[in-house]
């Protein structure tokens, strides 16, 4: 049985290329260790953007060079993706795995469409 995972349908990145969204899962058990993976789907290709395993009540720890950061609160994970450009526009899918204790559960959200608009370059001023 798949675990239910909810995430917003659409998010607009800010002018600095940062987008944030909440990934919420309906935990069937009392998980102590959870793995969250962000996948990007574009042109029927799915690639892993970032992943983190965290202990319940602790911070998410992504790799040092990751473009993702996040915090957790209960069954919610607040994810932030940085350094986005217009070409990164796409569907970002949240995958949650309850790694421990057993049994293992996994759920995949429907995805959040993140729109990224590159900022216009500032015109030269004559002042």
């Amino acid at each position: 049985k798949a675990m239910h995972v909810a995430q917003p349908a659409v998010v607009l990145a800010n002018s600095r290329g940062t987008a944030s969204f909440v990934c919420e899962y309906a935990s069937p058990g009392k998980a102590t260790e959870v793995r969250v993976t962000v996948l990007r789907q574009a042109d029927s290709q799915v690639t892993e953007v970032c992943a983190a395993t965290y202990m319940m009540g602790n911070e998410l720890t992504f790799l040092d060079d990751s473009i993702c950061t996040g915090t957790s609160s209960g069954n919610q994970v607040n994810l932030t993706i940085q350094g986005l450009r217009a070409m990164d526009t796409g569907l970002y899918i949240c995958k949650v795995e309850l790694m421990y204790p057993p049994p293992y559960y996994m759920g995949i959200g429907n995805g959040t469409q993140i729109y990224v608009i590159d900022p216009e370059p500032c015109p030269d001023s004559d002042f």
């Epitope: 009392k30 260790e33 790694m99 057993p102 049994p103 293992y104 759920g107």
Partner: antibody, heavy 122, light 112 residues
Framework: EVQLLESGGGLVQPGGSLRLSCAAS????????MSWIRQAPGKGLEWVSG????????DFADSVKGRFTISRDNSKNTLYLQMNSLRAEDTAMYYC???????????????WGQGTLVTVSS | QSVLTQPPSASGTPGQRVTISCSGS????????VYWYQQLPGTAPKLLIY???NRPSGVPDRFSGSKSGTSASLAISGLRSEDEADYYC????????????FGGGTKLTVLG
């Protein structure tokens, strides 16, 4: 081939210590939680301890709590069970097992080692 | 004493169908999957059924599992002499300090 190989068993006196090892091969060890299960001579299976894939979470049966510790070294693909203050009732065959999963499915303990015998006697 | 209850023994003749039961409670079988393991004499246990009724690759379809409420059962049809072994049910329990619980095991004897 997916394989688990236990070692470190033997004869030890009551109150003594022993460290069991379980070497994994043929799969991505760091992706799986692991367990130790024991079987006393002529008896059934008893779950002893479990550890998450990262090593950050552990559990123990009440019968061994405070005496046994479980750990893993993902760089060496090895699981450990440190057994202290051993008692005669700890005499058993000790198995390590992988807690499997695939897709959405929990697969239970899908890979077992051949076991290592621990005998506690004076 | 085991958390899950199994009959200590079962028997049948070659070709027969044999069923082994496993009884638990709402905190284990009632709210979790059931797994079955086969232990042939002198060997390590082997996963036979996972997720109540699924067979890993390589396990013959003569073996089938089912669950209803707080009980589960393993059925072996077309019994063979090589099926003589100990069979253990297993589940997870949310109310205990350790998450894994086993049945006491059932010794299956193939007669004749």
């Amino acid at each position: 081939e997916v394989q688990l190989l236990e070692s470190g068993g033997g004869l030890v006196q009551p109150g003594g210590s022993l460290r069991l090892s379980c070497a994994a091969s043929g799969f991505t060890f760091k992706a799986y939680s692991m367990s130790w299960i024991r079987q006393a001579p002529g008896k059934g299976l008893e779950w002893v301890s479990g550890i998450s894939n990262t090593g950050g979470s552990t559990d123990f049966a009440d019968s061994v709590k405070g005496r046994f510790t479980i750990s893993r070294d993902n760089s060496k693909n090895t699981l450990y069970l440190q057994m202290n203050s051993l008692r005669a009732e700890d005499t058993a065959m000790y198995y390590c097992a992988r807690l499997g999963y695939s897709g959405y499915d929990d697969r239970g303990m899908d890979v077992w080692g051949q076991g290592t015998l621990v005998t506690v006697s004076s | 004493q085991s958390v899950l209850t199994q009959p200590p023994s079962a028997s049948g003749t070659p070709g027969q169908r044999v069923t082994i039961s496993c009884s638990g409670s709402s905190s284990n079988i009632g709210s979790n999957y059931v797994y079955w393991y086969q232990q042939l004499p002198g060997t390590a246990p082997k996963l036979l059924i996972y997720g109540n009724s699924n067979r890993p690759s390589g396990v013959p379809d003569r073996f089938s599992g089912s669950k209803s409420g707080t009980s589960a059962s393993l059925a072996i049809s077309g019994l063979r002499s090589e099926d003589e072994a100990d069979y253990y049910c297993q589940s997870y329990d949310s109310s205990l300090s350790g998450p894994v619980v086993f049945g006491g095991g059932t010794k299956l004897t193939v007669l004749g």
